[in-house]
């Protein structure tokens, strides 16, 4: 049974130019995660963290993806494009797969505010 | 074709090492993961460990800890496995085996779909 | 680490009879469980992944089911070419092997 649950940094602003750092926190589980994948918004890998192996950063984002801060990863150089949905996927064992999901703004706005607080989706 | 071509068969002392290499072909290399197996004769298969062909991390069995090294060289497309002070218990076949799962489908599978022909070890003084 | 355990070690069959191969984990491993096919002298070959997944140009008289602990392989129709040594295989880390199961010609 999967007793987890996936906790996100929610929905986010950043500014052009700026760099984010998307966040998700698997809790209420004693599931050992196996790899945590990070998708853009038309579902294509920006990144890997495979428990074993470590990052794997897509060639096509190297330049602009970071890994990290522990199993999340942060997005640099923003541009308009960025702007859409994350989704981060927990491979569990035994539970499973667990999805969270984050929604990001790119404000062209120097006053964009980048919000760090956890939501459950 | 999609392939793995190892090195030949070795003899080799008790207290020795050996290097057994694995040469990919017909896929981007540094997309996937290379396990190694082996196979003493007459017995079952025996996971080693693996490495990333993407940024050289490696994981081993425990067994082997400290007496195996995997290593890539990406300019080559090969993979490498090294092991230390050699005993009889040792005498294998040697597989390599590519991981199912590209790092880029995101699927853990932990599954091996193509492997190397072998090469035999023979432990022997 | 888990433990896999094949049954039966080997067994009896004839051309044509259906065959069933069971994999037991020593602990949960979801669908984490993969199958070979390994002949005398050769390389295994992957026939199944993720409990019930078809490898590729593999024929379809082969099939897998199971998840959790229990595991099966199973082959509809048994040919000629089918009389080898069967591996399962889980991936939760470490991955592990089970002891294999020989079928040969009765």
């Known amino acids: 049974m999967m007793t987890g649950t996936i906790e996100t940094t929610g929905n986010i602003s950043a500014k052009k130019g700026g760099s984010v750092i998307l966040q998700c926190h698997l809790s209420s589980t004693m599931a050992q995660v196996t790899q945590v994948n990070w998708e853009q918004h038309d579902h294509s890998l920006l990144a890997i963290r495979n428990a074993e192996l470590g990052w794997h950063i897509y060639p096509a984002f190297k330049d602009r993806v970071a890994p990290g801060p522990g199993l999340g990863l942060t997005l640099q150089s923003l541009t308009m494009n960025d702007t859409g949905e994350y989704f981060c996927t927990y491979h569990t064992y035994p539970d499973g797969t667990y999805r969270g999901r984050i929604f990001l703004e790119v404000l062209e706005s120097s006053v964009a505010e980048h919000s760090a607080r956890f939501q459950i989706p | 074709q999609v392939q793995l071509v190892q090195s030949g068969a070795e003899v080799k002392k008790p207290g020795a090492s050996v290097k057994v290499s694995c040469k990919a072909s017909g896929y981007t290399f540094t997309s996937y993961a290379i396990s190694w197996v082996r196979q003493a004769p007459g017995q079952g298969l025996e996971w080693m460990g693996w490495i990333s062909a993407y940024n050289g991390n490696t994981k081993y069995a425990q067994k082997l800890q400290g007496r195996v090294t995997m290593t890539t060289d990406t300019s080559t497309s090969t993979a490498y496995m090294e092991l230390r002070s050699l005993r009889s218990d040792d005498t294998a076949v040697y597989y390599c085996a590519r991981d199912l799962s590209s790092f880029w489908s995101g699927d853990v599978l932990g599954a091996f779909d193509i492997w190397g022909q072998g090469t035999m070890v023979t432990v022997s003084s | 680490d888990i433990q896999m355990t094949q049954s039966p070690s080997s067994l009896s069959a004839s051309v044509g009879d259906r065959v069933t191969i069971t994999c037991r984990a020593s602990?949960?491993?979801?669908?984490?469980l993969n199958w070979y096919q390994q002949k005398p002298g050769k390389a295994p070959k992957l026939l199944i992944y993720a409990a019930s997944s078809l490898q590729s140009g593999v024929p379809s008289r082969f099939s897998g089911s199971g998840s959790g602990t229990d595991f099966t392989l199973t082959i509809s129709s048994l040919q000629p070419e089918d009389f080898a040594t069967y591996y399962c295989?889980?991936?939760?880390?470490?991955?592990?092997f089970g002891g294999g199961t020989k079928v040969e010609i009765k």
């Open positions: 602990q949960s491993i979801s669908s984490y």
């Open positions: 295989q889980q991936s939760v880390p470490p991955r592990t």
